[in-house]
Structures are given as C-alpha cells and as structure tokens.
C-alpha cells in the first residue's frame, strides 16, 4: 500500500477521496451558521453552539462525540457599571469620556449580548494620573524610555499602541515599570492599511473599532486557579491573590478616535525617533502629562470588570483507528469568540466542521484511518487557552503516551496573499510534500502547486527554493500540546503580505466588525482560500493518521538545531571577554547537535530499509519518531515558567506570540550586561547550555538502535 492509502478498504478511499470531498460551499455555509450571534466563552449561546456541533459531528459519522466541561476563571464587564476612561480637569470633572461600546455594524443593530470592549482579567480600579506614551510597550520601548530618555513611569498611566507583541506582555512590562494603569489603543499605522476603506466598506478598522483580548501572563498554566490540574468538580482552587498570571493594574482598550483625544494633548518629551510615531495627527509626545494649556488635566480610568468561575464546554469527537487505535492524531480549534468571530475563530471552526464531514463520509463508506483521529472544538481560548489546556491536563497521561500529533485550527485566514505555516521541524517534509500535491488558489498561479506559489511569495530566508516555515510560539491552543507535553504540532492559515506587522493581526481582529460579511465580501468571496486551508490542515491530519510510517523526518530537526546553536552562540559571542572570564563554552552543545545529526542520519537510513511488513518493528520505529518531540521536554520546565517545558522552543519571554529557540540560554543571556551579579548571571548561562546540551544528546539517543 502507498503511504497515504486508507486502511482495510478499497484503494479509492485515499487522500484524494478525502480532499475531493471538501467543498468551499460547505465551509461558507458553516461559517454563516457559526457567526450570526456572539459566542462568548461561558455564555448560554456558546453552550448551545457546543451542543449543535456535538449533534452535527455525530450525524457526520464520528464514533463518539462528548462534551468535556470545566469550571474556570473568566472575566466580564459589569453590565450596569461600564468601563471607560476620562480626561478630568483640576476640579475632578470629566471633560472627555471614551465610548462605552463600538457602533454596531449594519444588520447587527438589534443583536443582544455584544460584550463591550474590555481587557479580560483587568482588576477593578479608578486610577488617575499623568499619561506616558510608551509606543508598543515592548521590552525595548521601556529600555528606551527608562535608560535613554530617563523617563520614570512609576505612578503614571501608560498608553500603548497594540501590535508587534502580545498584549499581556505589554501589561507585564508596564507593571514592572511601575505604571498604575494601562490604556491600549489601535493606531491606524498598524490597523489601517493604506488605500482600503474602513468597515463596512472595506476591511480596515474604523475609528470606533476596538480590539478586545485577555491580558494574562499565564505562561502555559491554563485556568489561573488550578495550574497543572483540571478545573473539574472536585478541584482545589487557589485564592484570587495566588491565581496565576493576573494583572495587578487596571487595563482598558480604546479605538483611535478616542486615542486621538488623549494623545493630542500630550506634552513632555518628543518621540525619540520616527519608529515611535503612528499615523494619527498628534505629536506622539511621550509625556509625562499633557502640554502647557492642559497640564492640570489628568487621565482617569474607571474599570469595574469582575472575575468569575464559569463553566466552559469542549466538544471532543473520536474517529477510532483501525490498526493503531491507541495512537492519537488531534485536530483542534476553538469555538468561543469575542463577538461574532467572523475570522477568529469561526473561519477555522467552519474548516474543521467540513474536515469532520469529509472524514465522516469516508467512514460511512467503510473506511477507517489507521490511527485514531480526535477532533476538538475548544472553549475559552480567548480567555487564556483554557479549554484546551484543562482538557490536556485532564488527559495528560494518555496524551503523553499516545499523542502522535496536534494540528491547530484557529482562524483560517488573516489575509489572502499566501500560506503561512508554523510547525515542528518533524513536519517540514510532510508540509512540503503535501503542498506540492495541492493546487494553488492564488491568482497568477493557475495550474501551479500551492508549494510553488507559497515558495515564490514567502521564500525561506535560509534555504533556496523552499518556503518559509516559522517556529511555533504561543497564543493559541497548540500551546499545551507542544510546549508542555511535547507532542509534534503544526498550524496553517492564509496570511497577508505584511511581514513587518507579523504579530499585529488583521485590522478588525477582536472587534465587533469581525463578521461573516467581512469574510464573504472582502477576504474570500469564493471561499477558495478557506478550501485550501482545509486541504492543508485536513491533508496533514489524513497523512499523520493514515501513513504506515509516520511522516516525520528527524533530519530536519538536526538542521534547525545546528542553526539555533549558531544563533545563540553568536549572541553569546557579543560578550567575548565575559565568556573568557567565566569559562563559558558551547562545545558541549555543538557536540550534542553533531551527535544528533549523525544518529538522525543513521535512523533515517534504517527507516528506509526496514521490513515494513513486520508490525513489531514498524511500531518500534514509529514510536521512536512519535517520542522524539517528547524527548525535548525537560520535566522541570524553564526557569520561572514550569509549564513551558520544551528545551528547543518556547514562547518568547517578550512576546507570547513569537517562538524563541534555545529559550533557556536566550533568556539567561538577555540583557546580561545589566545584571548586578555578572558571575551569577554567567553561571546561569553555563547551566542553561548544560541543560540544552544534555537534552539534545538525550533526544539523539532515543533515535539510536534500541539494542
């Protein structure tokens, strides 16, 4: 049998049959169905949608579909006591107030339960004080403010523009700088593409549009009250003071009309350089405080949101494997949205729905995958990846023994320019081979493969003739599977041609204007990009679940390990004197990577030569491949981040969305020149090199001949 041929049935039921069954029209229909009302986590509407999906997945033919519920900490605005920000004069009178809600889009004026813009998990508070503009509130922005400009944010309210990094990192940075409140806003420079109209006439953000989002710093913990364990009916919950990752200062988001009113009065220091200026007609002065005429005016925040333990529901569907039912390939994406979820998440949920339908059709015709496929509709992703994390905590023992791969399925589109893939190196060859077999949906690439259009539009910076594949970071439901459990993971979506704004999202992200019409009118009228993403995600799942030998190439890990070792070594070599003084050597890491390379090469040769008709040897080789990702897990986790346990990859400590390689070494080296005790700091670098070298060597040995 060919590797993608189905199990125990006639050859017509192969990958092609699965892909041919996927229909753009169905994805469109499902998206419409999922986006007519809000599906905020913890609400009745989202519970009803969970039950609908459960029912439909059963109809599609899955063997079983269950709801898995958890009681987790969520956050909501106070319905009778709205959140807002004001400018107050010296008498304390409010002379300007920010808007209490977004103007609803046409056709949605009478929809109830649209949650107003808020920063989820903000504590309550009414701080008042002078404003300091902190650009994107990145680590380097605060370095610029504090070290170069000598501006002290202590006791100030900071205003930061959305974009570049995860909003939770912005809030953490502001807290560490001593701020007493944070205002987040969307600047047109980041959320208004030139030459495009604002919604409803185009896909740009209108001035009254606001990005919602959580501001936690969970570092992979899941429910803040039950870190490490499922939030089930007998859970022990921490007190709110001991909860993981909650912000300590009030935070609130606003649109650029309101931001204009705050920023136009700013005085104090001029912006340090052009990179601190957005596109509003304001000076982008840093402050602190307002300029001359307005210097007695202050900014006051009014935040009354509450944190509540609330029930959430995952939908878990099972398609049992015919040959290896104890090996799980998981396709998961979230269902909860901030409002309508036109892109996030329902463009992804609609694709998952169609993938389930296609698999179900094949199953009804007598087919089964070789391995078990689990389908998941996660809840409360927007509140900190809670549904996926709680389920993984509850099932961790099964997952760590049986988990082959996890494919994420949040938003299918964030643009319509080209494919974007982030995955473990183990999946590089799978992605390459699959995209070579799929047709490109791009204009100008008719009759060409997806691989060709993708490589042309998004070439790898390192490897000639290959497309860019990025490292996995976080900010989505793969986190627990990859960063905590070490299950090979990947994600794919269509993206924009906007490399400089990689982490800013699309303009209407998390706003009320993220509707079905946004997608149908402006992003993908024919749903051809959605169909392509369904083919990529579904094709990956099909091949992972059905190929006789797992489609993982360990040699690709060897290539990136050497690249990452070079990168971290070059960072360290910016301090040659200290490396000499403290006897810092990377030889152990280089040696471990070389050993990994040689062993991976030999393993690959054995993989090509072994007798695939011997089920014991086949299972043994597949287990070595499955457990390779697991071998990069350090049970002790990273320093101060116990749930980030992958030694090769972790979310950046400065931006949760971005992946960092050799994160333990990277963090130990970061800003090392400013450490008060250099001997201790360089000692930690040496320890992290040791941990990394040991882990790479240990992983290599899992690929050695077993006896």
């Amino acid at each position: 049998k060919s590797s993608n041929e189905a199990t125990n049935i006639t050859p017509k039921h192969n990958m092609k049959a699965f892909l041919d069954e996927l229909k753009a029209e169905n994805i469109k229909k499902f998206l419409y169905n999922f986006t007519q009302i809000p599906h905020l986590a913890g609400t009745e509407q989202n519970f009803q949608l969970a039950k609908q999906i459960q029912s439909q997945w059963k109809e599609f033919g899955l063997d079983s579909v269950e709801l898995a519920h958890y009681d987790v900490l969520l956050s909501y605005p106070n319905k009778t006591h709205p959140n807002y920000i004001s400018i107050i004069n010296e008498d304390g009178n409010e002379i300007f107030n920010t808007s209490l809600f977004e103007p609803p889009p046409p056709g949605y004026e009478n929809v109830s339960d649209i949650v107003p813009p808020f920063s989820a998990f903000s504590p309550q508070g009414m701080p008042e004080g002078d404003l300091v503009y902190v650009n994107y509130a990145r680590t380097e922005d605060f370095f610029k403010l504090e070290r170069d400009m000598k501006i002290n944010c202590s006791g100030k309210i900071v205003i930061a523009r959305y974009g570049k990094v995860f909003r939770g990192n912005k809030v953490k940075n502001a807290q560490l700088a001593g701020a007493k409140g944070v205002i987040l806003y969307s600047d047109p420079a980041d959320y208004f593409a030139p030459g495009v109209k604002s919604y409803p006439d185009g896909w740009n953000l209108p001035g009254g549009g606001v990005q919602r989002g959580n501001i936690l710093n969970l570092n992979g913990a899941g429910d803040p009250l039950t870190p490490g364990y499922p939030a089930n009916e007998y859970a022990y919950r921490r007190g709110i003071a001991e909860a993981v990752g909650l912000p300590s200062i009030p935070v609130h988001p606003i649109g650029y009309y309101d931001a204009q009113k705050l920023l136009e009065k700013m005085g104090g220091s001029a912006p340090p350089d052009s990179s601190w200026r957005g596109s509003l007609k304001v000076p982008y002065n840093v402050g602190p405080g307002f300029t001359g005429n307005f210097s007695t005016q202050k900014v006051k925040m009014h935040i009354h949101s509450t944190n509540e333990v609330t029930r959430i529901y995952n939908v878990i569907g099972t398609l049992r494997g015919a040959v290896e039912p104890d090996r799980y390939v998981i396709l998961g994406g979230h269902r909860d949205s901030w409002v309508f979820g036109g892109i996030d998440p329902q463009s992804g949920a609609a694709v998952v729905h169609e993938i389930v339908r296609s698999f179900g059709t094949l199953k009804k015709e007598g087919w089964r995958p070789r391995r078990t496929i689990l389908f998941a509709s996660w809840d409360a992703e927007e509140f900190g990846l809670l549904g996926s994390t709680e389920w993984a905590e509850e099932n961790s023992r099964l997952l760590q023994e049986r988990g082959v791969a996890y494919i994420n399925a949040d938003s299918s589109i964030e643009g319509n320019y080209t494919l974007r893939v982030d995955c473990t190196p183990l999946m590089y060859s799978l992605v390459h081979n699959l995209t070579k077999e799929l047709k490109s949906p791009d204009e100008g690439f008719e009759g060409k493969s997806l691989y060709e259009s993708w490589t042309k539009k998004s070439p790898s910076p390192e490897f000639s003739g290959m497309p860019r594949i990025s490292k996995l970071g976080s900010g989505n439901d793969f986190e627990v599977f990859f960063q905590r459990l070490g299950i090979a993971s990947g994600r794919a979506r269509y993206t924009k041609n906007w490399e400089t704004n990689k982490f800013s999202g699309y303009p209407l992200y998390h706003s009320v204007y993220e509707t079905y019409e946004l997608v149908e009118k402006f992003y993908d009228p024919m749903f051809k990009y959605h169909l392509t993403v369904a083919q990529v995600r579904g094709g990956m799942v099909f091949e992972l679940a059905n190929s006789i030998v797992l489609p993982f190439d360990c040699r690709d890990y060897a290539v990136v390990l050497r690249k990452y070792a070079d990168k971290i070594y070059s960072i360290s070599m910016k301090h040659p004197q200290e490396m000499k003084t403290y006897s810092v050597s990377f030889d152990s890491l280089f040696s471990a990577v070389k050993n990994f390379t040689e062993i991976a090469s030999k393993f690959s040769e054995r993989l090509q030569d072994f007798d695939k008709s011997n089920p014991i040897v086949l299972r043994m080789m597949n287990d070595q491949l499955m457990f390779l990702e697991r071998a990069f897990i350090d049970p002790l986790g990273l320093p101060d981040r116990p749930f980030y346990r992958h030694v090769i990859y972790a979310p950046s400590s400065h931006n949760k969305y971005a992946g960092e390689s050799f994160p333990g070494i990277y963090d130990a080296l970061f800003d090392i020149e400013s450490k008060v005790d250099p001997s201790k700091a360089w000692g930690e670098v040496k320890r992290q090199i040791y941990v990394a070298a040991f882990t790479v060597q240990a992983a290599a040995e899992t690929l050695s001949e077993v006896a």
Epitope: S429, F463, Y569, S570, K594
Partner: antibody, heavy 122, light 111 residues
Amino acid sequence: EVQLVESGGGLVKPGGSLRLSCAASGFTFSRYNMNWVRQAPGKGLEWVSSINSNSRYIYYADSVKGRFTISRDSAKNSLYLQMNSLRAEDTAVYYCAKTMGDYYYYYGMDVWGQGTTVTVSS
Amino acid sequence: SSELTQPPSVSGAPGQRVTISCAGSLSNIGAGYDVHWYQQLPGTAPKLLIYGNINRLSGVPERFSGSKSGTSASLAITGLQAEDGADYYCQSYDSSLSSYVFGTGTKVTVL
C-alpha cells in the same frame, strides 16, 4: 568502485549558459549530500553549491547565487549544475564531490570527480 | 576571499616534521564546525586526508595527523616523504556565510 564523472564543460561566451552533469556510481547516491567545487587557473578551491539527499536543502556561494542552479536525479544517479549569465570569473575546473553524510556543514568530501573545464571568454 | 588562512608555503627535508596552520574565526572553526584537510597533487583532483579534525581517511598514512584548538586547526606531516609534495587545503563551514569555506592553500615542498 566509487566514482564521479563530470561532463558538460566547454568554451562559452560571457552571458551564456552551460549545464554540467556528474554521473555517480559505486555508492548509494540517494543518501548523500552532493557538491560542486571549482578551481580557477592557478588558484585555490572554491565551494560553489550543495544539495542534500532529498533536494530540500540547497545552498549556493554568494558569487553564484541567482545565476547557478544545482539539482539531482536520484533515479539516474546524477548531479547537475545549470550555469546561466556566465562571467569571465567563472572560468575554472568544476569538480563534483560527495559529502561523507547528508549534512554538508559537518562532513568532508570524500569522493571527487576528475573535473570538467569551463572557459568563459569572448 | 577565503575565511580560512593558511601559510602560502612550507618546506622540509625528507624525514622532517612540518605543520600547516589553518586560522579561522568564531563563525567557523570557533563555532564548533569540523575541519577537514585535502591533498591536491599537481594536475589531479583534491583528495580527502583528514575529516572531523583528527580522523584519517582509510588508506591515508599515519604520518598525517590533524588537530583543532579554538579558532584554528593544523595538519602535521611527520617523516616527510617526496610524494607528500602537493597543495594542501583545510575546509570547514561558516555559519555567518552559510557556506563551506576552504583555506587559502599551502604548497608543501620537499627539499
């Protein structure tokens, strides 16, 4: 016997093209990284390009990037170098060489062909 | 321009010991990349002598040995023989260039 035999060299005008071939025998060609290395008259060795066993990792020297294309056909046990926009400074003996493993950055080149001469001149 | 520097020539009488140095940088030899040594007799293709810093290819006489330390490497020929007269090249990988790098080459003359 392990052997590499280059062919396709010759005299070409500046701006012209040539395609070099390298026929491999005596080893499992599909398992090894392969390279092109050149040597200008009276000069030292200069690495030109490298391709791994499954043609996914391809590298070029900066001096030939965008002009030369390396490829391989494992079914034919052959390595190729398509050279376009040739310049006078590309004049050299071109060697095909096998790497000891599938990772060009670790291993030495243990098998070399006899070389084929490329002369770029008007 | 090569990233690995070798002396243009070394010479010695038969039976003598000669060493050829190969000076690299922190992005090649100093970054843990192996050094390999090649011998090129006049009018012939290069031949691998030493791989992985210190390992002799089978069939290479024991009088050839390699070593590596820090950002440099060296090839020693003990008991020099007439047939050792040739050009010798070191080779490594440079991570900043993402490419193989050869040394400038050393001509060994047997007096």
